[in-house]
């Protein structure tokens, strides 16, 4: 229903704490370079204004849309053009064009230093002195680095962060308590960031219909006992919520998400038997718990999918009368029977089924034509199954770091034009799929692997779109979202690439590498590996192994030397010479 004052309505629904957190996230995602202090000042102004509107909905400006109010605030920032250049041009536009303009200027790879976690004592001191400010900084730092992070979920992670600090800051060994717990929150949040970016990409590039199809498949897998009408309702709501968050309507998004959680908990009987534990939790945890809920048990008496979608003589009539609904029903029926498939695979099968009906229903004898459609699914199912098998075997053989290196070599050969930092980031993330998915039971591996890879490849596409350098990457990224992963998997060595000339400085290292944390050391080595492949794209696995082994020994030796600098200076050139020879 319409409210006189949108901002008053959201403030009342969300409560002051969540309202302020969401406004801070919104501003941090739009203006990613502004310091925390500047944003928090704006947040306070907006909050004070919202309170005046709660007191009197007819007060001046209370009837304005939230986009108008937020946009006016952002555009009033002094020196906006100095700091943001052409983003300031957005301020000359009217809503809704102004908001669209802000969205287009979101930077997926902002030039910000990696978020450094302070050491335990310092963290606990600042948390205990001012928890609100500490958590505000967390929201700000994550939101500005991830401008599409799902806002209500980020509030949830801030709450988790708060819990960990509250618990660990009273311990004697704070670091031992904090490190693993915060690492776990960080890992989950980073995965959440790439997954949500994929959802926003889907929405931006292919519209609501594509996103809704994704939602139908996902919900059907999770809630196989729910009727199609119920799944459709849930998918429609989830699509609306995600559209709002991807579009910067964070208050409405969070409010609608809470509403959906309430609806699901009030209608457990028609949705799933697994919801009760989630429904006892407070709002943020409830929504998060529902989003991560385990699959309900598949009904025992499901008939063969062929009955309604191949054998029924009215297939073409039914399809012609309501194509999207008929295909939606197919997707629902297939997905609820296959929690062991990835959503990407299920959508590829639905697409194949649609193409088959489009072709066959226009022919003379449709049943004869579409009669074999389910058998034709087999190669589509086998391809990702083989991908999972070969990659998990490789991961088990090499471990995470070795597997990342294998992926890095593979992807540098596929797209050597892509910048080394982007390739290293992508390979490290793709390589984590092993740890994340290969240890799971067989039935969970495929959905875990393929849907995670799809999200990581979407990140690669988003970064590549900013500065396109590889025709092959552009081709895979331009196609349908569900075909991306197979497209990348099918890429081979780029024969058109002219190898990079060998630059000694690329492979020159200094003693500072010795004091780096393990992760940074790995990145240095992986950067060198990518550069080697760019120099010799057709180097054999053995050649690369030799050079990298030699390199690891060199670093190890010099870091143990009494005079480290001297060791790096004298041994370095020898290493470079040996490497050139090994790759000749």
């Amino acid at each position: 229903e319409a409210h006189k004052s949108e901002i008053a309505h959201r403030f009342k629904d969300l409560g002051e704490q969540h309202f302020k957190g969401l406004v801070l996230i919104a501003f941090s995602q739009y203006l990613q370079k502004c310091p925390y202090e500047e944003h928090i000042k704006l947040v306070q102004e907006v909050t004070d204004f919202a309170k005046t509107c709660v007191a009197d909905e007819n007060a001046e400006n209370c009837d304005k849309s939230i986009h108008t109010l937020f946009g006016d605030k952002l555009c009033a920032i002094p020196k906006l053009r100095d700091n943001y250049g052409e983003l300031a041009d957005c301020c000359a536009k009217q809503e809704p064009e102004r908001n669209e303009c802000f969205l287009q200027h979101k930077d997926d790879n902002p030039n910000l230093p990696p978020f450094q976690r302070p050491e335990a004592e310092a963290m606990c001191t600042s948390f205990q002195e001012n928890p609100t400010s500490f958590l505000g900084h967390y929201l700000h730092e994550v939101a500005r680095r991830h401008p599409y992070f799902y806002a209500p979920e980020l509030l949830y992670y801030a709450e988790k962060y708060n819990e960990v600090l509250t618990q660990c800051c009273t311990e004697s060994d704070k670091a031992a308590c904090l490190t693993p717990k915060l690492d776990a929150v960080k890992e989950k949040a980073l995965v959440a960031a790439v997954r949500q970016r994929m959802k926003c990409s889907s929405m931006q590039r292919f519209g609501e219909r594509a996103f809704k199809a994704w939602a139908v498949a996902r919900m059907s897998q999770r809630f196989p006992n729910a009727e199609f009408a119920e799944i459709t309702k849930l998918a429609t709501d989830v699509t609306k919520i995600n559209k709002e968050c991807c579009h910067g309507d964070l208050l409405e998004c969070a409010d609608d998400r809470a509403e959906l959680a309430k609806y699901m908990c009030e209608n457990q009987a028609t949705i799933s038997s697994k919801l009760q534990a989630c429904c006892d939790k407070p709002v943020l945890q409830k929504s998060q718990c529902l989003a991560e809920i385990e699959h309900d048990n598949i009904p025992a008496d499901l008939p063969s999918i062929a009955a309604d979608f191949v054998e029924d003589k009215e297939v073409c009539k039914n399809y012609a009368e309501a194509k999207d609904v008929f295909l939606g029903t197919f997707l629902y029926e297939y997905s609820r029977r296959h929690p062991d498939y990835s959503v990407s695979l299920l959508l590829r099968l639905a697409k194949k089924y649609e193409a088959t009906l489009e072709k066959c229903c226009a022919e003379g004898d449709p049943p004869a034509c579409y009669g074999t459609v389910l058998a034709e699914f087999q190669p589509l199912v086998e391809e990702p199954k083989n991908l999972v098998k070969t990659n998990c075997e490789l991961y088990e053989k090499l471990g995470e770091y070795g597997f990342q290196n294998a992926v890095l070599v593979r992807y540098t050969q596929k797209a050597p034009q892509v910048s080394t930092p982007t390739l290293v980031e992508a390979a490290r993330n793709l390589g984590r799929v092993g740890t994340k998915c290969c240890t799971l039971p067989e039935a969970q591996r495929l959905p875990c692997v393929e849907d995670y890879l799809s999200a990581i490849l979407n990140r690669l596409c988003v970064l590549h779109e900013k500065t396109p350098v590889s025709e092959k990457v552009t081709k895979c990224c331009s196609g349908s979202l569900v075909e991306r992963r197979p497209c990348f998997s099918a890429l081979t060595v780029d024969e058109t690439y002219v190898p990079k000339e060998f630059k000694a400085e690329t492979f020159t290292f200094h003693s500072d590498i010795c004091t780096l944390p393990d992760k940074e050391k790995q990145i240095k080595k992986q950067t060198a590996l990518a550069e080697l492949v760019k120099h010799k794209p057709k180097a054999t696995e053995d050649q690369l192994k030799t050079v990298m082994g030699d390199f690891a020994q060199f670093v190890d030796k010099c870091c143990k030397a009494a005079d480290k600098d001297n060791c790096f200076a004298t041994e370095g050139p020898n290493l470079v010479a040996r490497s050139k020879e090994a790759l000749a």
């Epitope: 039914n318 012609a320 194509k323 008929f326 229903c361 226009a362």
Partner: nanobody
Framework: QVQLQESGGGLVQPGGSLRLSCAAS????????MVWVRQATGKGLEWVST????????RYADSVNGRFTISRDNAENTLYLLMNSLKPEDTAVYYC????????????????RGQGTQVTVSS
């Protein structure tokens, strides 16, 4: 809101022809499948013919196949049914219909329908 207005019915002798039209508004006609159904006095709704959004897929009930032709003009938001070699058993009220969200496909009582146009085949 969805509006469907049939026209073109009338009294015709057996073996004669009629062309029914259906003017559609209030929904995305060019992306919607369309249906003709009919109802003889004292009987239930009977499906006659279906045409897909892009006219590529066309289906007829066995009782009218070879005699009736369904077509559409997406530019004019109009559905047609050309009826040749009419028989007394074709006498009925003819409705054009389209799928209503939330209904079951093929459950024509739940589809959006117009007021209907009467076709009477008699000598």
């Amino acid at each position: 809101q969805v509006q469907l207005q049939e026209s073109g019915g009338g009294l015709v002798q057996p073996g004669g022809s009629l062309r029914l039209s259906c003017a559609a508004s209030g929904f995305a006609f060019s992306t919607s499948g369309m249906v003709w159904v009919r109802q003889a006095t004292g009987k239930g709704l009977e499906w006659v013919s279906t045409i897909s959004d892009d006219s590529r897929i066309i289906r007829y009930a066995d009782s009218v196949n070879g005699r009736f032709t369904i077509s559409r003009d997406n530019a004019e938001n109009t559905l047609y049914l050309l009826m040749n070699s009419l028989k007394p058993e074709d006498t009925a009220v003819y409705y054009c219909a389209t799928y209503r969200a939330g209904s079951r496909i093929g459950s024509y009582e739940d589809y959006y329908r117009g007021q209907g146009t009467q076709v009477t085949v008699s000598s």
